[in-house]
Interface confidence: low
């Protein structure tokens, strides 16, 4: 399942972030 952590990140099987930004490792913004 998917859960929202305290920092507002949507955590799934691979901790993929829904609020991607400059600091989000799981985003595409390198």
């Amino acid at each position: 399942g998917w859960t929202l952590n305290s920092a507002g990140y949507l955590l799934g099987p691979h901790a993929v972030g829904n609020h991607r930004s400059f600091s989000d490792k799981n985003g595409l913004t390198s």
Partner: antibody, heavy 113, light 112 residues
Framework: EIQLQQSEAELVRPGALVKLSCKTS????????MHWVKQRPEQGLEWIGR????????IYDPNFQGKASITADTSSNTAYLQLSSLTSEDTAVYYC??????WGQGTLVTVSA | DVLMTQTPLSLPVSLGDQASISCRSS???????????LEWYLQKPGQSPKLLIF???NRFSGVPDRFSGSGSGTDFTLKISRVEAEDLGVYYC?????????FGGGTKLEIK
């Protein structure tokens, strides 16, 4: 609870180097990029660069290439920023950042003879 | 590098007034994935910056609805509908679409 605890203020001599630490808790550092941001006194914010602690891959703003080195120790969940050949231009507060929500309290580095 | 230009540098307001801050980027900050990673932060004196808005117009959790973000391409705006004392500080825009990531120069919101 997510915490980023940065090292104490540093007073360093011109030409020296300094290594700042950012001890994290409440999350696994491997799961996030760790960034460093510079703020000179009464000035704005500058992005220095970031590291992927899982593989030590780092990228930098070209302005900080050769000046800054970002490393991480996954065993202690700590990120580091090393600054070399310090000058008065390096006098600033340095923040570590995890996710765009979580910032450390900042470390003041003062470069003075 | 993407230059982020904020105006005004200083914004004197009366409590209860509306405030508007502009941020222009020197090139499009639409990412190749189609999203625009434009954020707004507030830094109060002696504190670390705090996120207000992400991806142009999304309020972060806990941010009052008097804050709103808008814009597209290269032109972005942060509006505060009714300024309260706790809103005073320096506001920064930030682009997280293109490396190196860059901040605007800041806008100081102060009491008139």
């Amino acid at each position: 609870e997510i915490q980023l605890q940065q090292s104490e203020a540093e007073l360093v001599r011109p030409g020296a180097l300094v290594k700042l630490s950012c001890k994290t808790s409440g999350f696994n550092i491997k799961d996030y990029y760790m960034h460093w941001v510079k703020q000179r006194p009464e000035q704005g914010l500058e992005w220095i660069g970031r590291i992927d602690p899982e593989n030590d891959n780092s990228i930098y703003d070209p302005n900080f290439q050769g000046k800054a080195s970002i490393t991480a120790d996954t065993s202690s969940n700590t990120a580091y920023l090393q600054l070399s050949s310090l000058t008065s231009e390096d006098t600033a507060v340095y923040y570590c950042v995890r996710g765009y929500v979580d910032w450390g309290q900042g470390t003041l580095v003062t470069v003075s003879a | 590098d993407v230059l982020m230009t904020q105006t005004p540098l200083s914004l004197p307001v009366s409590l209860g007034d509306q405030a508007s801050i502009s941020c222009r980027s020197s090139q499009s900050i639409v990412h190749s994935d189609g999203d625009t990673y434009l954020e707004w932060y507030l830094q109060k004196p002696g504190q670390s910056p705090k996120l207000l808005i992400f991806k142009v117009s999304n309020r972060f959790s806990g941010v009052p609805d008097r804050f709103s973000g808008s814009g597209s391409g290269t032109d972005f705006t942060l509006k505060i509908s009714r300024v309260e004392a706790e809103d005073l500080g320096v506001y920064y825009c930030f682009q997280g679409s293109h490396v190196p990531y860059t901040f605007g120069g800041g806008t100081k919101l102060e009491i008139k």
